[in-house]
């Protein structure tokens, strides 16, 4: 009933709660003297389903058979309509359509930790659309059965609040859940288990790591566990890795030695626990412990390269370069590099510690045989020194690699190829490919890059520190004992026409010809390796095509003579530059009139 129903009643048969697909009979009847005032046959009873009329009848009562009601709640209201007046609400009823509960499935129970409480979950099956009460019962020792009701609309979990203890770990417990509503009831299959089956230990806590004598080879992981734990799983990985190392241990009693950790590496450690070899479940993984392993002395050797530059008749500049050790070789923070320079015949040696740089430049006499040794040091020791005898790397012409070429290979890569030297190719012990940005004036501060290649290789892909639209000077060295030969070439990974032409800064007259001087195009406007310059000239005020002279590009060249100009004729001159991709726009224009005598 949904109203005071003073004027009449609505009855529902067989029940207000019906099974989906059932038929109901709804009767609306007026109480005595509650009809229309004048003539009771004028009573018009109307039945509404929600707001929609579904039936009406003149008289004191109305019967309606209703089918096809949907799942859920449907509201029926009976109203009285009299002539010349509004409809009056008589009474109403709600009908609840649903289904009997399905058998609950997959009942499972767990107790989280030895101090936790038993909680069970199950699958309800399809929604009944009716108020359904679930009762969970747990039977066990001493003939006891604990029960708990759940009155939530969607109940699929209950915590008994009971703590199972290990006094008799083999005792059997049986759980069962029963669903009941107005249309029926259904019970799950029983789930039988022991204490050891359902207790899921809490994850280990208070995880610590100790390195005895600050050594990575003497490492022990410690943790705390609940009292009954028998098994542990340990997993650990370097923080930058996705793959875990796994270890299973029995009766660890909260400690385990790890033997395969790498030095100077941040690791993540986690531990999980279990009460029994084959019963029960593993705990969640513990919170992560992150710890860095101690340093060990570096392994491996530095990759060292050098450059020699002639200063004057008695002195030369040596620039040493080396690459950082990989993290696995450095095995710690490199504090400094030790460079030792020695004159081999006189035995003079000088040692220097370099911090913060991977290069060193010094000036030495041009006479004598010199050698260098470079090693890297961390807090635990030094790497083995890399020894190099300083020689003239390009002295042996017969060792020079032949037919060196440099071609763009995708984005920011250059493929360098060569042919072995004419001299017995088997004498080559290794090739070194060296590259640096091309800077007019041969600036020694420009970073040097190199890679080593095995003697049977005749190509190398260079990609480190390669930028688009920059020209690189590339050298290929063939090394054999204390001798070396080299060949060089210019190359770029990507090019386009230069953004500007050279700027003519002077034109001078010399013995009937002229010498044109220009400023180099700024490196950032060259847009790759320059192949040629072009000098254009034509008579002023002439419409004729200009003449031109094409000069192969050479790094150091910035002047060129022209001897085909007529005396006492005013010419306009300008220059362009070319890469493999095309020609630049004009540089500045200059006028010049040759003063010399006519031929």
């Amino acid at each position: 009933k949904i109203d005071a129903c003073k004027r009449g009643d609505v009855t529902v048969k067989p029940s207000h709660v019906i099974l989906l697909g059932s038929t109901v009979n709804i009767t609306c009847s007026l109480k005595p003297r509650q009809g229309c005032f004048h003539y009771s046959r004028r009573n018009k009873l109307i039945l509404y389903k929600f707001d929609r009329r579904i039936n009406f009848h003149h008289g004191h009562s109305l019967n309606s058979q209703v089918t096809g009601l949907p799942l859920g709640t449907t509201l029926f209201v009976c109203k009285l309509a009299c002539i010349n007046s509004d409809e009056i609400q008589i009474c109403g009823a709600e009908i609840f359509v649903g289904v009997a509960p399905e058998q609950p499935q997959n009942l499972s129970c767990i107790q989280k930790g030895e101090q936790g409480t038993v909680a069970c979950t199950w699958e309800r099956g399809r929604d009944t659309h009716l108020y359904t009460e679930y009762t969970l019962q747990l039977s066990g020792p001493k003939n006891l059965t604990w029960q708990k009701q759940c009155k939530d609309i969607y109940c699929d979990y209950l915590d008994f609040g009971i703590n199972l203890t290990p006094e008799s770990p083999e005792s059997n417990f049986t759980a069962k859940v029963t669903a009941v509503n107005s249309l029926g009831s259904s019970s799950s299959l029983p789930s039988t288990f022991t204490f050891l089956d359902i207790v899921r230990p809490l994850p280990p806590w208070d995880i610590r790591i100790k390195f005895q004598k600050a050594s990575v080879s003497r490492c022990t992981l410690y943790w705390r566990d609940e009292g009954l734990v028998l098994l542990n799983r340990l997993r650990y990985r370097p923080s930058n890795s996705r793959l875990w190392n796994m270890v299973n241990v029995t009766k660890a009693k909260g400690r385990h030695d790890l033997l395969d950790l790498k030095p100077f590496t941040e690791y993540e450690f986690q531990i999980s626990s279990k009460l029994h070899l084959y019963k029960g479940s593993w705990s969640d993984w513990s919170e992560s412990l992150r710890a860095q392993t101690p340093e060990e002395e570096p392994t491996g050797m530095l990759d060292v390269w050098y450059m020699k530059r002639h200063i004057d008749y008695s002195r030369q500049q040596i620039s040493l370069f080396w690459k950082n050790l990989s993290v696995s070789e450095a095995r710690g923070k490199i504090l400094h590099y030790q460079v030792t320079l020695q004159e081999l015949t006189g035995g003079k040696a000088m040692t220097q510690n370099i911090t913060g740089h991977t290069s060193w430049t010094t000036v030495i006499p041009r006479t004598g045989n010199w050698a260098v040794a470079v090693s890297a040091a961390n807090s635990k020791g030094s790497s083995l020194p890399t020894r190099i005898n300083i020689m003239n790397l390009c002295e042996a012409g017969l060792l020079a690699p032949r037919q060196v070429s440099a071609n763009s290979e995708g984005m920011d890569n250059i493929l360098v190829t060569w042919q072995p030297p004419r001299k017995d190719p088997s004498a080559v012990q290794e090739y070194v490919v060296e590259w640096r940005e091309l800077h007019p004036g041969g600036d020694t501060q420009v970073p040097l890059n190199w890679l080593r290649s095995r003697p049977y290789n005749v190509s190398a892909l260079i990609s480190e520190n390669i930028k688009s639209y920059i020209c690189y000077e590339i050298r290929v060295y063939a090394l054999s004992g204390d001798q070396g030969g080299c060949s060089s070439i210019l190359g770029n990974s990507k090019h386009k026409a230069p953004l500007s032409g050279p700027h003519i800064n002077a034109i001078t007259e010399e013995k009937g010809s002229i010498l044109i001087s220009w400023n180099s195009i700024p490196v950032q406007e060259q847009m790759g390796c320059l192949l040629h310059y072009r000098i254009y000239w034509k008579e002023r005020d002439s419409n004729s095509q200009p003449q031109l002279c094409e000069i192969p590009y050479r790094v150091s060249q910035n002047s060129h003579p022209i001897n085909s100009l007529q005396p006492r004729v005013t010419y306009v001159l300008w220059m362009t530059a070319l890469t493999a991709a095309g020609e630049s726009s004009h540089g500045n224009e200059r006028e010049f009139c040759l003063q010399g005598k006519a031929n």
């Epitope: 101090q115 409480t117 066990g140 020792p141 001493k142 006891l144 604990w146 029960q147 708990k148 009701q149 915590d159 008994f160 609040g161 009971i162 703590n163 199972l164 203890t165």
Partner: nanobody, 125 residues
Framework: QLQLVESGGGLVQAGGSLRLSCAAS????????VGWFRQAPGKEREFVAA???????TYSEFVKGRFTISRDNAKNTVYLQMSSLKPEDTAVYYC???????????????????WGQGTQVTVSS
Amino acid sequence: QLQLVESGGGLVQAGGSLRLSCAASGLTFSGYTVGWFRQAPGKEREFVAAINWSSAYTYSEFVKGRFTISRDNAKNTVYLQMSSLKPEDTAVYYCAARRSRTSWYASTAEAYDYWGQGTQVTVSS
């Protein structure tokens, strides 16, 4: 300190009903497991029913289906509704409480820390 006071006992005919109350004072009751025990003259004290803090409940075999245990934490009271009483239900009824976790073995008197003075229930035939 928790004090427990039982009430609601009395004389009733066989087949009749009684509702026993166990009221707690001194501490909030909601976290406790509460049990009802009874002792007939010349017999051992025996377990009747228990209800824990999460409203899970258990009954001894001889009262199952006849007695209902419930709690009203707002009133700090636990109730034992007894119906279809039999002469063999005659005894002094005690309520008991324990604060710590509910053990499975809530049917043993040793599991409880606090006890009331008891209320007499007599069922005549």
